[in-house]
């Protein structure tokens, strides 16, 4: 393409660069549905924001294709554990795409936090962090799931969160 | 704005793009003050650097407003724990802004690492990682705090650190 | 340099910006060699990709100098532990450079995951995440090491991985 085309492209790029897609969603009282669905998130209040990405029913929705660093942290805790010391937490980031009927695992962690509690009355805390670069097409969605979500502790949006930015 | 203005803006952006703000600060012997203040960091030696951000008394200081991915890891460890299994670590990234008198929680983790030491062997290790995107204005500061900081282990700057980059 | 030079530089930057270096490598059956070397990774299948970085024998090889956010997660687990509850995991990112004969520690974590198992027959899971910004020159390499690698659990590339992107 000629200089004019290149110029237009550069102008375009500068403008799009101004809104390099990024988002940070925070945990809220409504995050844990108990329905078997993904965690839900706050998108506007406090530290939460969406810039060049959208949100739908727990999912970050990609509007511009590219490589994204996606991340999530969940705060775990309890007094004892529902399944005792054998309780396992699976915390994962999953992709939904129109091209497949099922969610695709992207980044996953398994932890046994309850070994930290030596009796049913023991208070314990733990945290799980995930982050990595994945390619996402426009229209694809990313969600966070935690099994067993009864062990997730929410408070003020700083301890459990979900975000992404284009790299 | 006309082509000339756009050109200037592009040139400007290219220059600023060369110094996309980023920093990585490392733990040092002086990091733990025991004063109740934030952790202090090495800014120049070894792996530590500042690029488009400045540093003051433990804080990364923002010079250019924008969205930043901020992160911190702390290496935890000990021989037994001051409060036994009930010992809890809180590791957090906090914002200081001229607009509020108090620090604002940005990203926080709580862990009960002392359950990792059992029976006669009292030695344990654990690690806490935090990372997420936040909006920061010029002049605002981010600090790292750990409570109880007696459980933080420093050595060579690779195990406990603090950083940020604009996204 | 004059406008023409600036124009060329901008065009160049736009093109290079299109391939801002990034990579995400995933764990595979062949990752654990037991040879004392670094972990090996899948570079093409599934979620794995290389863009503006290359790969050689477990190492991400830098082709363009700059600051990179590098990261790794490893999934740990077992039934009991080889050294009992005292077992310590060291998970680290290390740099290889032609300028030094030995690897340089970049980011390191130590964990005592086996305290999560309350008896020799107890199944446990844990996870270790590392991420931080480091400066890398062209030709330098980054590898992941885990000691004791017998405690690393591989499955489908989502639980143990290694990546980087220029910031």
């Amino acid at each position: 393409d000629g200089p004019a085309g290149s110029w237009e492209q550069l102008i375009q790029e500068r403008r799009s660069h101004e809104v390099n897609p990024a988002a940070h969603l925070t945990g809220a009282n409504s995050s844990l549905t108990g329905s078997g669905g993904p965690l839900l998130w706050e998108t506007q209040l406090g530290l939460a924001f969406l810039r060049g990405l959208s949100y739908h029913d727990g999912a970050l929705v990609v509007t511009k294709a590219g490589y994204y660093y996606i991340y999530s942290k969940v705060q775990l805790g309890g007094v004892g554990c529902p399944l005792g010391l054998a309780s396992t937490i699976t915390h994962g980031l999953y992709k939904r795409t129109p091209r497949y009927p099922e969610e695709l695992e992207l980044l996953v962690s398994q932890q046994s936090p309850c070994g930290r509690a030596t009796s049913s009355s023991r208070v314990w805390w733990d945290s799980s962090f995930l982050g990595g670069v994945v390619h996402l097409e426009a229209g694809e969605e990313v969600v966070v799931r935690v099994l067993d979500e009864r062990l997730v502790r929410l408070r003020d949006g700083t301890r459990s969160y979900f975000g992404a930015f284009m790299v | 704005d006309g082509p000339a203005g756009s050109w200037e803006q592009l040139i400007q952006e290219r220059r600023s793009h060369e110094v996309n703000p980023a920093a990585h600060l490392t733990g040092a012997n002086s990091s733990l003050t025991g004063s109740g203040g934030p952790l202090l960091w090495e800014t120049q030696l070894g792996l530590a650097f500042l690029r488009g951000l400045s540093y003051h008394d433990g804080a990364l200081v923002v010079t250019k407003a924008g969205y930043y991915y901020i992160y911190s890891k702390v290496q935890l460890g000990g021989v037994g724990c001051p409060l036994g299994l009930a010992s809890t670590i809180t590791h957090g990234l906090y914002k200081r802004t001229p607009r509020y008198p108090e620090e604002l929680e940005l990203l926080v983790s709580q862990q009960s690492p002392c359950g990792r030491a059992t029976s006669s062997s009292r030695v344990w290790w654990d690690s806490s990682f935090l990372g997420g995107v936040v909006h920061l204005e010029a002049g605002e500061e981010v600090v790292v705090r750990v409570l109880d900081e007696r459980l933080v282990r420093l050595r060579d700057g690779t195990r406990s650190y603090f950083g940020a980059f604009m996204v | 340099d004059g406008p023409a030079g600036s124009w060329e530089q901008l065009i160049q930057e736009r093109r290079s910006h299109e391939v801002n270096p990034a990579a995400h490598l995933t764990g595979a059956n062949s990752s654990l060699t037991g040879s004392g070397g670094p972990l090996l990774w899948e570079t093409q299948l599934g979620l794995a990709f290389l863009r503006g970085l290359s790969y050689h024998d477990g190492a991400l090889v830098v082709t363009k100098a700059g600051y990179y956010y590098i990261y790794s997660k490893v999934q740990l687990g077992g039934v009991g532990c080889p050294l009992g509850l005292a077992s310590t995991i060291t998970h680290g990112l290390y740099k290889r450079t032609p300028r030094y004969p030995e690897e340089l520690e970049l980011l390191v974590s130590q964990q005592s995951p086996c305290g999560r198992a309350t008896s020799s027959s107890r199944v446990w899971w844990d996870s270790s995440f590392l991420g931080g910004v480091v400066h890398l020159e062209a030709g330098e390499e980054v590898v992941v090491r885990v000691l004791d690698e017998r405690l690393v659990r591989l499955r489908d590339g989502t639980r143990s991985y290694f990546g980087a992107f220029m910031v």
Epitope: - | V79, P82, L83, G84, L85, S120, R122 | -
Partner: antibody
């Protein structure tokens, strides 16, 4: 100032139990571990175990397991050590020792309680 | 358990002289560059008194003539110039592993 005041001397018969108290003052009671140590005549110091006042969690020296119990009364900032199935070799001075700020040493000690086991 | 062995059993020293007490552990008491070794002084009819913690740190209120050194399995307590009030029994103690164990003690007596 930090003070640990222990209960008075006791004389017990073999097979009996003894309960020694240690009342703390001058610091935040729940912030420090309390250890128990004894010194038998002509012997050195011997660690019996520890209690964490914040939770009541205990760790005992295997040698005393099953015979010793530590308890805490947070309302009075007092810890107790009960030793059962006493034998003559349990004759000793029993001390409580506060865990230091870095918790792996004992920076303040009670005055000691002499327990004599004799038929 | 970790066995602590002190030597000598008895040390006869004149006031003003230097006293060097030794303590050996049956295995290393180090963790992350720190030694989990403490020294106590005990006088007849009194409770023990903490002198040195973590091998070389002087406890608050303890005179500077007391110093500790060593790492791994071998440790030393030094009293640079003995005063009359220093004649007592000295115990080393490890806290890296349960049960905490003490040495059998070194009695420092007047020569």
């Amino acid at each position: 100032q930090v003070q640990l005041v222990q209960s008075g001397a006791e004389v017990k018969k073999p097979g009996a139990s003894v309960k020694v108290s240690c009342k703390a003052s001058g610091y935040t009671f729940i912030d420090h571990i309390m250890n128990w140590v004894r010194k038998a005549p002509g012997q050195g110091l011997e660690w019996i175990g520890r209690i964490y006042p914040v939770s009541g969690e205990t760790n005992y020296n295997q040698k005393f397991m099953g015979r010793v119990t530590f308890t805490v009364d947070r309302s009075t900032s007092t810890v107790y050590m009960e030793l059962s199935s006493l034998r003559s070799e349990d004759t000793a001075v029993y001390y409580c020792g506060r865990g230091s700020y870095y918790w792996n040493a004992m920076d303040y000690w009670g005055q000691g309680t002499l327990v004599t086991v004799s038929s | 358990e970790i066995v602590m062995t002190q030597s000598p059993a008895t040390l006869s020293v004149s006031p003003g002289e230097r006293a060097t007490l030794s303590c050996k552990a049956s295995q290393s008491v180090d963790f992350d560059g720190e030694s989990y070794m403490n020294w106590y002084q005990q006088k007849p009819g009194q409770a023990p008194r903490l002198l040195i913690y973590s091998a070389s740190n002087l406890e608050s209120g303890i005179p500077a003539r007391f110093s500790g050194s060593g790492s791994g399995t071998e440790f030393t307590l030094t009293i640079s110039s003995l005063q009359s009030e220093d004649f007592a029994v000295y115990y080393c103690q490890q806290s890296i592993e349960d049960p905490w164990t003490f040495g059998q003690g070194t009695k420092v007596e007047i020569k």
